[in-house]
């Protein structure tokens, strides 16, 4: 392994993020080498950092569901962070799954 945990979100942010400023999210999964499960929310402004959140929290689940059913104009990106450079914190995003749904909105 090339450093393992340093590529992962290690603790959940205490901050929350308003739904309307989030573009998409990706999942960090322990099965792929990270120590904790996490949801990383990507802000619409690319200059802003991702927010690492606990997938068990109600507000996180609400925001994920909202994003799951909202089609985005862009095609889903294969792999992790392929559409942007390595962020300032140096995380490469190993052990994550992109979930930018753009085909089938799940509205009622």
């Amino acid at each position: 392994s090339d450093g393992g945990a340093q590529d992962c979100c290690l603790k959940y942010s205490q901050r929350k993020i308003p739904a309307k400023v989030v573009r998409s999210y990706r999942k960090q999964e322990p099965s792929l080498g990270c120590s904790i499960p996490a949801i990383l929310f990507l802000p619409r402004k690319r200059s802003q950092a991702e927010l690492c959140a606990d997938p068990k929290e109600l507000w996180v689940q609400q925001l994920m569901q909202h994003l799951d059913k909202t089609p985005t104009p862009r095609k889903p990106v294969q792999g992790c962070r392929k559409d942007r450079g390595v962020p300032k914190n140096g995380k490469k995003g190993k052990g994550c799954k992109r979930t930018e749904q753009s085909q089938t909105p799940k509205g009622p």
């Epitope: 689940q61 909202h66 059913k69």
Partner: antibody
């Protein structure tokens, strides 16, 4: 058919307790957050409490915080509301509602709770 | 605590357009939903995510949300639209609030 069926309402004295149940059917229960919403006679809707998919995360309206407890049993497809220290102003029809994102897409028909001596 | 303010009643002539407002501090930064409730019945979702319509809800129902006001618009009002209407939104802490409700009367 997607359905929510509340039960457990009735007449209770002030200071008493009651446990409401909501049986869910026709959908994958553990894939949705759930809420309780109440409506006092002749009044508007008031959100009471919400719970995350697996029951880890809960939120409450200020008016019931410390007195009511929301819970769920995903193996039984059932949502609960334990109501303690009941007051006259808790008298209402209590609805359970399925949450998806930022809205309620399925509602039960409600169960009436009357708090009176 | 956060409050949403609706007019107690709104009247509209048959076939005309009704607008029901929902005022709240920066409600435009959150997602608003609207529910229709007829006497003795459970509420029914008519608008979600500010301006989306669930399947089965007529196109005559539409929504908007910006600044401090969310608005439900019912065009070509019909007698069957007579009901109480409630707006709702969630804050970032997963706490929900409903407006006080608006009784819509269709005249004629």
């Amino acid at each position: 058919e997607v359905q929510l069926l509340e039960s457990g309402g009735g007449l209770v004295q002030p200071g008493g307790s009651l446990r409401l149940s909501c049986a869910a059917s026709g959908f994958t229960f553990n894939s949705y957050s759930m809420s309780w919403v109440r409506q006092a006679p002749g009044k508007g809707l008031e959100w009471v409490s919400a719970i995350s998919m697996e029951g880890y995360s809960k939120s409450y309206a200020d008016s019931v915080k410390g007195r009511f407890t929301i819970s769920r049993d995903n193996s039984k497809n059932t949502l609960y509301l334990q109501m303690n220290s009941l007051r006259a102003e808790d008298t209402a029809v209590y609805y359970c509602a399925r949450g998806y994102g930022y809205y309620f897409d399925v509602w039960g028909q409600g169960t009436l709770v009357t708090v009176s001596s | 605590s956060y409050e949403l303010t609706q007019p107690l009643s709104v009247s509209v002539a048959l076939g005309q357009t009704a607008r029901i407002t929902c005022g709240g501090d920066s409600i435009g930064s959150q997602y608003a939903s609207w529910y229709q409730q007829k006497p003795g019945q459970a509420p029914v979702l008519v608008i979600y995510d500010d301006n989306e319509r669930p399947s089965g809800i007529p196109e005559r129902f539409s929504g908007s949300n910006s600044g401090n006001t969310a608005t439900l618009t019912i065009s070509r009002a019909q007698a069957g639209d007579e009901a109480d209407y409630y707006c709702s939104s969630w804050d970032m802490d997963a706490v929900n609030v409903f407006g006080g409700g608006t009784k819509l009367t269709v005249l004629g």
